[in-house]
Interface confidence: low
């Protein structure tokens, strides 16, 4: 049976197409291509007589096309005009006809998309973003990519107009992009530039930095307050509630204890109207922040009860600080026998006896800190005394 | 001449001027680049770099997307090539993406 | 400076003095033009830039690499930490052998 086959069957716009012929009969008297799908002389594109090996060109004929002899038909340099059915015509010698159809579709080359958007500039969590992919064409695929990647599922993401438009319901700042669009059809794919939001948000609660709360005298006191935003904040620093500078950082040298105090950044951005503050507290002491692990030290750890004495000793290199005993985490002293000496540094037991057995610690402190000894074990024994008649104890 | 007073221009196109900052870069003959500081062109407020406090004034001109350096009391040793570049604008603060070709200052007596 | 053949591949280092949270970014600059960002935050290839170019690193550490060398690779190459403000690194002058 006689068929045609068209290679490609899309077509790029300007390029060409074969209709390609199957099973053409062998005595043959000629064929005629008629555009459409069925034989109508208005319509011919191209007759051929196999006798004169003539081409006569119909009222169809636009001189791009080509026939040979094996019945196939070239079109050249096509247009979406071309796009449609083709009917071949074959006239054998018994004057008997058969006929086939085929089709093609042109498809244009997409030129590089571009990606408009009614609002570049949006305010976070507050605006919704469009962004159109241009030009709208006909027969196109549109697809949308952010940061390289296909469009996640989200709520926040509506596509609509056929997928050519993509809407960012309340942004965030996260959706900066880049954004691109790609049309496609069968023939072409483009992408566009890629496109960016910028997001206007914030400022976020500050964070002032250093950590540090507490300054020894004469310390430079240099702080920096930063806030997620943009545009970028405008800070200004309160101390105690009275406004001092509208700097991002603030510096105070050879502080004193009169520097003590709460420290407000206050962190505004002028186009979302938001204002953030944080307030920090700064300590400027001559005791330390941070007091050393004290050392404990004992006369002896293994004593006889009620006959020997021990003494325990605290050691520390801090100054400005206090000592205090613990024994089984009850506070000393806690008996008579108990005595603190030399600033409580050192624990005296007179005489030791079995309860007195145990763990010992010390700890020492200022109002802003303290710090624990590891502790120290007492062992107390006691020596059996021989009975007269030579009986041990029982 | 040493003891004058040069300015020099730096006009963006093609994006929104109020959006990137803009720094400025100095390359002193046979040396390599130098980050003079930056303006927010959003808010006018200038950033020096340490080197560039004192003679160094950034300006702007935001209806013209403007950008301008102003080199007080020359020195010898600011004749340079000076370069506007446009801070990058990214999730994240980017560097400078795009740069001016340069403007050459020449200081002689 | 650093010399190197046509088609061969060339890498440059750069150490920062603490911890940059990887913001490094690489330039290309050409003698009368405006230095060209290739690369930001760390590996992040600009738009246009072709894929012979890349770069890593974390921490202090950093590397950019050229492959596949052509003539007009020849530049001077600079890092740029922008963590803390910006600091620019030395200039690497690259030469074709």
């Known amino acids: 049976q006689l068929t045609t086959e068209s290679m490609p069957f899309n077509v790029a716009e300007g390029k060409e197409v074969l209709l390609l012929v199957h099973n053409l009969p062998q005595q043959l008297f000629g064929y005629s291509w008629y555009k459409g799908e069925r034989v109508d002389g208005n319509r011919q594109i191209v007759g051929y007589a196999i006798g004169t090996q003539q081409a006569t060109p119909g009222p169809a004929n636009s001189g791009r096309e080509t026939i040979y002899p094996n019945a196939s038909l070239l079109i050249q340099n096509v247009t979406q005009n071309d796009t449609g059915f083709y009917t071949l015509q074959v006239i054998k010698s018994d004057l008997v006809n058969e006929e086939a159809t085929g089709q093609f579709h042109v498809y244009p080359e997409l030129p590089k998309p571009s990606i408009s958007s009614n609002n570049s500039n949006p305010v976070e969590d507050k605006d919704a973003v469009a962004f159109t992919c241009e030009p709208e064409t006909q027969d196109t695929t549109y697809l949308w990519w952010i940061n390289n990647q296909s469009l996640p599922v989200s709520p926040r993401l509506q596509l609509s107009n056929g997928n050519r438009t993509l809407t960012l319901l309340s942004v965030t700042r996260n959706d900066t992009g880049p954004y691109e669009c790609e049309i496609q059809n069968p023939v072409s794919a483009n992408r566009s530039d890629p496109v960016t939001l910028n997001v206007t948000y914030g400022p976020d609660t500050p964070t002032i930095s250093p950590s540090d709360t507490y300054y020894r005298p004469g310390a430079n006191l240099s702080l920096s307050c930063y806030a997620a935003s943009n545009p970028p904040a405008q800070y200004s620093w309160l101390i105690n509630g009275t406004f001092q500078q509208s700097t991002q950082e603030l510096f105070i040298p050879n502080i004193t204890v009169n520097n003590s105090g709460s420290y407000t950044c206050h962190a505004n951005n002028s186009v979302t109207g938001c204002n953030r503050t944080t307030v920090k507290t700064i300590i400027v002491t001559e005791l330390s922040p941070v007091v050393a692990k004290p050392q404990i030290k004992a006369s002896k750890t293994t004593v006889t009860g009620d006959k020997d004495s021990v003494n325990l000793t605290c050691s520390t290199n801090d100054t400005g600080i206090s000592i205090r005993w613990f024994f089984k985490n009850q506070s000393l002293p806690s008996s008579e026998r108990m005595k603190l000496s030399q600033g409580n540094t050192t624990l005296s037991i007179n005489p030791v006896k079995r309860e007195d057995a145990g763990t010992y610690w010390c700890e020492v402190f200022n109002p802003i800190s303290k710090n624990q000894s590891d502790p120290i074990m007492l062992n107390v024994n006691y020596n059996a005394l021989p009975q007269e008649n030579g009986l041990s104890p029982g | 001449k040493p003891g004058e007073t040069v300015k020099i221009s730096c006009k963006a196109s093609g994006y929104t001027f109020t959006v990137y900052g803009m720094n400025w870069v100095k390359q002193a003959p046979g040396k390599d680049l130098k980050w003079m500081g930056w303006?927010?062109?959003?808010?006018?407020?200038?950033t020096y770099a340490d080197d560039f406090k004192g003679r160094f004034a950034f300006s702007l001109e935001t209806s013209a997307s403007t950008a301008y350096l102003q080199i007080n009391n020359l020195k010898n040793e600011d004749m340079a090539t000076y370069f506007c570049?446009?801070?990058?604008?990214?999730?994240?603060?980017?560097?400078?993406?795009?740069w001016g070709q340069g403007t050459s200052v020449t200081v002689s007596s | 400076s650093l010399s190197a053949s046509l088609g061969g591949k060339v890498t440059i280092t750069c150490k920062a003095s603490?911890?940059?949270?990887?913001?490094l970014a690489w330039y290309q600059h050409k003698p009368g033009k405006g230095p060209r960002l290739l690369i930001h935050y760390t590996s992040t290839l600009q738009p246009g830039i072709p894929s012979r170019f890349s770069g890593s690193g974390s921490g202090r550490d950093y590397s950019f690499s050229i492959s596949n060398l052509e003539p007009e690779d020849i530049a001077t190459y600079y890092c740029l930490q922008y963590d803390n403000l910006y600091t620019f690194g030395g200039g690497t002058k690259l030469e074709i052998k």
């Open positions: 570049a446009r801070k990058a604008f990214y999730r994240y603060d980017g560097g400078m993406d795009y």
């Open positions: 603490q911890d940059i949270n990887k913001f």
């Open positions: 303006i927010n062109t959003y808010t006018g407020e200038p």
